[in-house]
């Protein structure tokens, strides 16, 4: 409640998160008639990457495109891009939606179509659907340990969230520990009213929020934080229009002295922790 | 029509080696991945090599490093060089046409898309 007589200040908040959970993966590649059938282990290096700001991210599902190579090649064929003869390709063209740079020859994709010839990473990137259901689906059971430091200047008080008592095995429930600060993703979705399984195929953003109401007079001092969660990327995009959450990344390997790359389109959820909030004194 | 001639079976003793040769005719290999799949006496038949319509190979762990499977320029033949040949080797041996799957060192028929087309097998004997 609004204690007008009250001096109030906002919150100022650092965060750390430490993500943990194993996930054992089985993925099917299908190419030239044969599907080959992958078993791997992702730990904690395998599915996050440090982000900026007070976010992290969880890889959730993932497109391989292997042993890609710095060399000649056409195209894929997406919509717009094949060619009958040289005429429709241009010699150094970079077109946006390709993955290299045009020699200026029309050459053979497969045995039907045909597309221009570029120099980029080959063979070029085709475009798959995300697998479903996603490839670490069971990144649901994966917890997060959130760590909020709070800072009030003007009141010269600071706190956070996680306190001495705290049990490091606890999980956070809204009824039965509300103030534990270990998170299970699976949870914070059904917190959200969202559908892990679903979002993890495409990928989403989740916004963990925590709010501090505190109240900093010695008489009735209280400053615990309540932690809310809700979606915060727009789930009724169109299809066709870049939905989810998802970006690409390399791995670089020799082989046979000659320079190659894994390229990985990662989908996932990205978390984003949005800390508010007020400390009162009179 | 699909056929598939094997060619080079025999007998050759322990440590010995073997080509046999698999004549395709009624298709090219860019249509479909090529396999050699064993049956020995009394035990099931099983996958010993792959070579997909791309050119990637893929062998059973039980003959990694002793067999190789390659093609003729012209993509017509597939061959199966078999080295440092054991007597648990004995068995006919055929060429497959068709889908396969590959799992850790394990190779099988892709049943979902089809039986495939089998040669009629050539005999592999390896004493000791």
């Known amino acids: 409640s609004d204690k007008l007589y009250q001096r109030k200040e906002p919150v100022i908040s650092s965060v750390h998160t430490k993500v943990k959970g194993i996930a054992e993966v089985t993925e099917n590649v299908t190419e030239g008639g044969v599907t080959k059938l992958g078993h791997s282990i992702f730990d904690t290096a395998d599915y996050t990457f440090p982000l900026q700001g007070n976010s992290f991210f969880v890889m959730t599902n993932y497109v391989k495109s292997e042993g890609q190579v710095q060399t000649l090649c056409p195209e894929y064929p997406r919509r717009g891009a094949q060619c009958s003869s040289d005429r429709r390709c241009k010699k150094g063209w970079m077109d946006p939606q390709s993955k290299g740079i045009q020699t200026g020859r029309c050459v053979p994709y497969d045995k039907t179509r045909k597309t221009c010839e570029v120099s980029a990473w080959c063979p070029t990137e085709e475009e798959k659907e995300a697998p479903r259901p996603a490839l670490l689906r069971s990144a649901e059971n994966f917890t997060v340990l959130i760590k909020n430091n709070i800072h009030f200047p003007g009141h010269n008080y600071t706190t956070r969230n996680i306190l001495p008592t705290m049990n490091g095995s606890c999980t956070f429930h809204k009824t039965w520990d509300p103030q534990c600060s270990i998170f299970r993703l699976g949870d914070i979705f059904q917190e959200a009213g969202e559908n892990f399984t679903e979002v993890a195929v495409q990928g989403g953003i989740m916004g963990i929020e925590i709010y501090w109401d505190c109240n900093l007079d010695s008489w009735s001092h209280h400053c615990r934080p309540r932690y809310s969660f809700r979606r915060l990327d727009d789930k009724n995009t169109d299809e066709s229009f870049v939905p989810g959450y998802n970006f690409r990344y390399a791995k670089y390997y020799k082989e046979n002295n000659v320079e190659k790359r894994t390229l990985i389109k990662a989908f996932g959820i990205r978390f984003d922790i949005l800390v508010f909030g007020t400390g009162g004194k009179f | 029509e699909v056929q598939l001639v094997e060619s080079g079976g025999g007998l050759v003793q322990t440590g010995g080696s073997l080509r046999l040769s698999c004549a395709a005719s009624?298709?090219?290999?860019?249509?479909?991945?090529i396999a050699w799949f064993r049956q020995a006496p009394g035990k099931e038949r099983e996958g010993v090599s792959i070579l997909s319509s791309i050119g990637k190979t893929f062998y059973a762990d039980s003959v990694k490093d002793r067999f190789s499977i390659t093609a003729d320029g012209a993509k017509t033949t597939v061959f199966l060089q078999m080295n440092s040949l054991k007597p648990g080797d004995t068995a006919i041996y055929y060429c497959v046409a068709g889908h396969f799957v590959y799992n850790d060192g394990a190779i099988s028929l892709n049943t979902a898309r089809g039986s495939g087309f089998w040669g009629q097998g050539a005999q592999v004997t390896v004493s000791s």
């Open positions: 009624g298709f090219t290999l860019d249509d479909y991945a």
